[in-house]
Interface confidence: low
């Protein structure tokens, strides 16, 4: 570690005095101190002499000697006071810049240590410090304002009491800069815009930051727009607003608009799209198939997406039949707005009844006219089966009628014994009817098919069963010939008729 001679921490001299500071180390040594006039530096190998033969108050400060070659980086320091009765302060810098919540050192060095008891910090023109200003003083370094705030950006003077009067230093300007957490915050409204050719439009790009030093611009399809900027300050933020007003939009105004703001921390940008259309438009669509099939008793939500400009003047769901003139209950219809120009309308149909099959139309109106989107709702039913014995062209025939939707398939079974339902062990014969006759296929109704089984002689200790099935379920009817005639009945677990 280098050694300074004289070996004292502080040295007090009068103006005009000769001061010689000698630093000795193992290798070459260097001096560092406040920038001041009249010093002469003389180096001789491992020692360096800093001297002046006319010390002034400006030589007041801490002089440090370091040994660059020392791996431990040791240093020695001496503080020199040049005690000038007319100049109690040596100000090392007239502007200090810090960020908020940092300590701000105002470097006014006291030229006479005796004056320490009477020092104070004031704002220029004798104004007191702002409330909550927390500061400390060091005669070697000056005043430190702790955790400086933006509002403390002021001009300060250091005051010392000399012979009963206060003597001020030259002023020091403190600039406390806001800590900028990142690029400015941005808003671009609206997020999307549609206008008819000739209408007026407004696009507002605004940026805000805790610091006033930021730029904002609005660009259209990569071309920067020249728009007057409005500035404001509220909620402790600086705001810059660019408002693009278009009296009569045309196609050349359409396209992508980007709001871009930048500061030292970087750049933010946000975009919106502006569509210019020839005339009002109203488009209806659905992600669902317009032909819906639902099992009776289940529920269904019909959804329509609407894209419209200008906004809707009216809309409703209508039941178009065929079963009744009932209309959907308003409480079952709801609307959600996805954004300004897109909406979703939903009709909830819980626990569907047979009379609710048919066509449902969503109608909407805006200045562009009326549009409608129609759904066809067909209900699915499990088959219902019945069997009768009859004679057709003189032949004994079992006639099976099956109703359901989708169209049921028919299978005949002949089994031994009297039973409500043939099981595998009892089955004697199976006939599939690939093409049963379709009796009824009315829209939105069940499909009724008929299958004939010609039986020359009915075996009395046997059961004839007609089974029908579709994608929803199955149904059956057992026919048991008895000597007194024929007995027919459905199985005990026969499916309900809605």
């Amino acid at each position: 570690i280098p050694v300074i001679e004289p070996s004292v921490p502080e040295l007090v001299v009068k103006p005009g005095a000769t001061v010689t500071l000698r630093c000795v180390g193992n290798g070459s040594v260097e001096w560092d101190g406040p920038p001041s006039p009249h010093w002469t530096l003389y180096s001789d190998g491992s020692s360096s002499i800093l001297s002046t033969n006319n010390a002034t108050f400006q030589n007041t400060g801490t002089y440090r000697c370091t040994e660059p070659g020392d791996p431990l980086g040791g240093s020695a320091a001496i503080h020199l006071y040049v005690k000038d009765p007319a100049r109690p302060w040596n100000v090392l810098a007239q502007e200090v810049v810090v960020f908020e919540d940092q300590d701000a050192l105002l470097p006014c060095l006291l030229t006479d240590p005796v004056l320490e008891a009477g020092v104070s910090l004031v704002r220029v023109r004798g104004r007191p410090l702002m409330r909550h200003t927390n500061y400390s003083f060091s005669p070697w370094h000056g005043f430190t304002i702790h955790r400086a705030k933006f509002i403390q950006s002021q001009d300060y003077q250091c005051s010392a009491l000399m012979g009963g009067r206060k003597v001020m230093s030259i002023s020091i300007r403190l600039k406390v800069q806001k800590v900028i957490p990142g690029p400015p915050a941005l808003t671009l409204v609206p997020a999307e815009l549609v206008r008819i050719r000739g209408e007026a439009a407004q696009i507002v790009c605004s940026a805000s930051s805790v610091d006033v030093n930021f730029d904002v611009f609005l660009q259209h399809n990569n071309t920067k727009l020249a728009i007057p900027q409005q500035s404001d300050f509220h909620n402790n933020r600086y705001q810059k607003v660019l408002t693009l007003n278009l009296d009569q939009v045309d196609f050349q105004h359409a396209g992508n608009y980007s709001c871009v703001a930048s500061n030292v921390q970087g750049k933010h940008s946000t975009s919106m799209f502006f569509r210019v259309v020839e005339s009002a438009y109203l488009n209806l669509s659905s992600e669902q198939n317009l032909i819906q099939e639902v099992t009776v008793g289940e529920g269904l939500n019909l959804k329509v997406m609407v894209e419209a400009y200008p906004g809707l003047q009216g809309f409703n769901w209508t039941y178009l039949g065929p079963f009744s003139d009932h209309q959907p209950e308003p409480k079952l219809a709801n609307a959600t707005t996805k954004d300004t120009y897109r909406h979703t309308f939903t009709l909830s149909l819980p626990r569907l009844k047979p009379s609710e099959a048919g066509r449902y139309s969503f109608l909407a109106r805006n200045p562009g006219g009326w549009r409608a989107l129609t759904f066809e709702l067909t209900l699915r039913y499990p088959p219902e089966v019945s069997v009768i014995w009859t004679f057709i062209n003189g032949s004994g025939t079992l006639l099976c009628a099956a109703s359901g939707y989708p169209q049921p398939n028919v299978t005949w079974l002949q089994c031994s014994g009297h039973t409500d339902r043939c099981d595998e062990a009892q089955v004697l014969q199976v006939w599939d009817d690939p093409y049963p006759e379709v009796l009824s296929q009315e829209p939105f109704h069940k499909v009724t098919v008929q299958s004939l089984l010609t039986v020359e002689t009915l075996e009395h200790n046997q059961t004839y069963e007609c089974r029908a099935h579709n994608s929803v379920g199955s149904g059956s009817w057992a026919f048991i010939p008895i000597s007194a005639g024929a007995h027919t009945h459905p199985p005990d677990e026969f499916l309900f008729t809605p």
Epitope: R197, G198, Q248, D250, F251, Q252, R275, V277, E278, S279
Partner: antibody
Framework: QITLKESGPPLVKPTQTLTLTCTFS??????????VGWIRQPPGKALEWLAL???????RYSPSLKSRLTITKDTSKNQVVLTMTNMDPVDTATYYC????????????WGQGTLVTVSS | DIVMTQSPDSLAVSLGERATINCKSS????????????LAWYQQKPGQPPKVLIY???IRESGVSDRFSGSGSGTDFTLTISSLQAEDVAVYYC?????????FGQGTKLEIK
């Protein structure tokens, strides 16, 4: 059958205001999308679009002349009026009114035109 | 403003021959949303008002001879007269109606060679 006819003074002095009337038949300016425009043609020169008014009173003007032009319509009279202030000899031209179909901007029926001379 | 430039300024074609007039716009007059070109062609005979021949760049106005056809898209358009007749002598103008101010070309004078 659509017809249009322009009327107005054949001669105006510099700085005066020109008022031109377009009287039409065969269509109504209350029909959605329909417009009536004014186009002029200096002698021996090209056509220049001036202004257009639509059924809904939406008005369009040539930006270079906007401060001098006013277009109005009287639907009940089947008339469109164009006024042009501060006339100058360079405004000497044949002034046409024309029918624009369905919010398009082109002109499918034209009047015969009226020649306006600006001279002191 | 969109500038419409026609070429040539004047054209002399023999009777029965094909005549071609070009029109170039300083920016595209094709609107992608509906895929329409906002361009019309007019014919003007001496002492008469203009008469529309073609609109939407290629749709012939009713009553206009099928000798007249329009083509092109974006910025480059052509009016073609397939077989020149004596009554086709006139000045031809293109006009864009994509954005206001709607602008006309400077005109092409068509004469018989």
């Amino acid at each position: 059958q659509i017809t249009l006819k322009e009327s107005g003074p054949p001669l105006v002095k510099p700085t005066q205001t020109l008022t031109l009337t377009c009287t039409f038949s065969g269509f109504s300016l209350s029909t959605s999308g329909v417009g009536v425009g004014w186009i002029r043609q200096p002698p021996g020169k090209a056509l220049e679009w001036l202004a257009l008014i639509y059924w809904n009173d939406d008005k369009r003007y040539s930006p270079s002349l906007k401060s001098r032009l006013t277009i109005t319509k009287d639907t009940s009279k089947n008339q469109v009026v164009l006024t042009m202030t501060n006339m100058d000899p360079v405004d000497t031209a044949t002034y046409y009114c024309a029918h624009s179909p369905r919010y398009s901007g082109y002109f499918d029926y034209w009047g015969q035109g009226t020649l306006v001379t600006v001279s002191s | 403003d969109i500038v419409m430039t026609q070429s040539p300024d004047s054209l002399a074609v023999s009777l029965g021959e094909r005549a071609t007039i070009n029109c170039k716009s300083s920016q595209s007059v094709l609107y992608s949303s509906n895929n329409k070109n906002y361009l019309a062609w007019y014919q003007q005979k001496p002492g008469q008002p203009p008469k529309v021949l073609i609109y939407w760049a290629s749709i012939r106005e009713s009553g206009v001879s099928d000798r007249f056809s329009g083509s092109g898209s974006g910025t480059d358009f052509t009016l073609t007269i397939s077989s020149l007749q004596a009554e086709d002598v006139a000045v031809y103008y293109c006009q864009q109606y994509y954005s206001t101010p709607y602008t006309f070309g400077q005109g092409t004078k068509l004469e018989i060679k």
